[in-house]
């Protein structure tokens, strides 16, 4: 894992932390799939998207993500060196208009319609955890990531570095 | 001020062993990624190892993979490497540096260290 | 693994000149990719990251881009202090690369 030693440790600061421009550094349009090749796909259902973790048939086309990445600088650290971190977050947008969100009393993930500025609620920090995989922790509440849960993505509490690792918060990055 | 201070390099025989330091300071330590890079004399920069700032799964360069060992002490603020079976080809100036983000390796490393050199010869 | 080529490897320029170096990586990085300059018996400084942000405190007359394979940095009016070697490196997946270095020197 990337983290520290106790997730909160650094994760405390995100509440106060600002997105240092409102324009991303970069832009990447991606599939997103589980640790365990899961395809992340989006449905339009009732005029409302659904999000879905499943098995796509073989040469079956996978659902794009604009991943948009800022930086976020938070406030000076507790040991008082006054070094500020600097943090990379994400939106995720499958389609014009539409965020990824946290819902957090529900510990779901859902896709809103929104106008910018996006809301809090729309921004993830980045991990990047083994080689090739990547985590995303609710801006709005710290040590709480988007995962897999019942083949859907859920909103998933993780106490301690070393659980920064389990496979149902590990997501890759595909541009195929 | 961010500081990164490499020392413990020296002369060694080949089939030697070594162990590198970096003492840092200015920043929260257990906050960042850690990465060593060399440069044999009159070459350019070689990326060696990485560790993460809670000092899991560590990577390394294929040239090094089972001689070195990256590690980290959070509570001494200190970067280590050892290494081992030492080869001429390993001769270089090492340089310790920190990543640019906290939780994210993407951004390339911001600080360095003014580096320490090896220098592996019978 | 992923290679990196940078090109020219040595260039010859004057005060006041724009240079341009190119990097290719052998397969995408999307944008993660940085860009150091450094100095004869001096440590690498970071001067762009993610391909086209300027690093904290340096001029403004250094700029990157490009994404994917194909990426450049340009110094639009080269300064004395300038002169130096500039190296490329992919931070997108391990083992991390660098290029093999461009050398700007005084024509």
């Known amino acids: 894992a990337f983290g520290i030693s106790g997730v909160q440790k650094y994760t405390r600061a995100l509440h106060d932390s600002s997105i240092t421009g409102i324009s991303p550094i970069t832009e990447y349009l991606a599939s997103l799939s589980t640790y365990n090749d899961q395809s992340i796909t989006f449905a339009l259902e009732d005029e409302s998207y659904e999000i879905y973790v499943e098995d796509l048939k073989k040469d079956e086309k996978k659902d794009k993500v604009l991943l948009s990445y800022y930086e976020s600088q938070h406030p000076s650290n507790e040991s008082g060196d006054g070094v500020d971190g600097k943090m990379l977050m994400v939106t995720l947008s499958p389609t014009k208009d539409f965020w990824l969100h946290a819902n957090n009393k529900e510990h779901s993930v859902e896709l809103h319609k929104c106008e910018k500025p996006l809301p809090d609620q729309a921004f993830f920090v980045l991990h990047n955890m083994h080689s090739n995989c990547v985590s995303f922790e609710c801006k709005t509440d710290p040590g709480v990531f988007i995962g897999v849960k019942d083949n859907h993505l859920a909103l998933i509490k993780v106490d301690s570095s070393e659980n920064l690792c389990t496979e149902n918060i590990l997501f890759k990055l595909s541009e195929t | 001020e961010v500081q990164l201070v490499e020392s413990g390099g020296g002369l060694v025989q080949p089939g030697g062993s070594l162990r590198l330091s970096c003492a840092a300071s200015?920043?929260?330590?257990?906050?960042?990624?850690l990465t060593w890079v060399r440069q044999a004399p009159g070459k350019g920069l070689e990326w060696v190892s990485f560790?993460?700032?809670?000092?899991?799964?560590?990577f390394y360069a294929d040239s090094v993979k089972g001689r070195f060992t990256i590690s980290r002490d959070n509570s001494k603020n200190m970067l280590y490497l050892q290494m081992n079976s030492l080869r001429a080809e390993d001769t270089a100036i090492y340089y310790c540096?920190?990543?640019?983000?906290?939780?994210?390796?993407?951004?390339?490393?911001?600080?360095w260290g003014q580096g320490t050199l090896v220098t592996v010869s019978s | 693994d992923i290679q990196m080529t940078q090109s020219p490897s040595s260039v010859s320029a004057s005060v006041g000149d724009r240079v341009t170096i190119t990097c290719r990586a052998s397969?995408?990085?999307v944008s993660w990719l940085a860009w150091y300059q450094q100095k004869p018996g001096k440590a690498p400084k970071l001067?762009?990251?993610?391909?086209?942000s300027l690093q904290s405190g340096v001029p403004s007359r250094f700029s990157g881009s490009g994404s994917g394979t194909d990426f450049t940095l340009t110094i639009s009016s080269l300064q004395p202090e300038d002169f130096a070697t500039y190296y490329c490196?992919?931070?997108?997946?391990?083992?991390?690369?660098l290029g093999p270095g461009t050398k700007v020197d005084i024509k």
């Open positions: 200015g920043f929260t330590f257990s906050s960042y990624a």
């Open positions: 560790i993460s700032g809670s000092g899991g799964r560590p």
């Open positions: 001067l762009i990251y993610a391909a086209s």
């Open positions: 397969q995408g990085v």
């Open positions: 490196q992919q931070s997108n997946s391990f083992p991390f690369t």
């Open positions: 540096a920190k990543s640019l983000y906290t939780t994210s390796w993407y951004g390339g490393f911001d600080s």
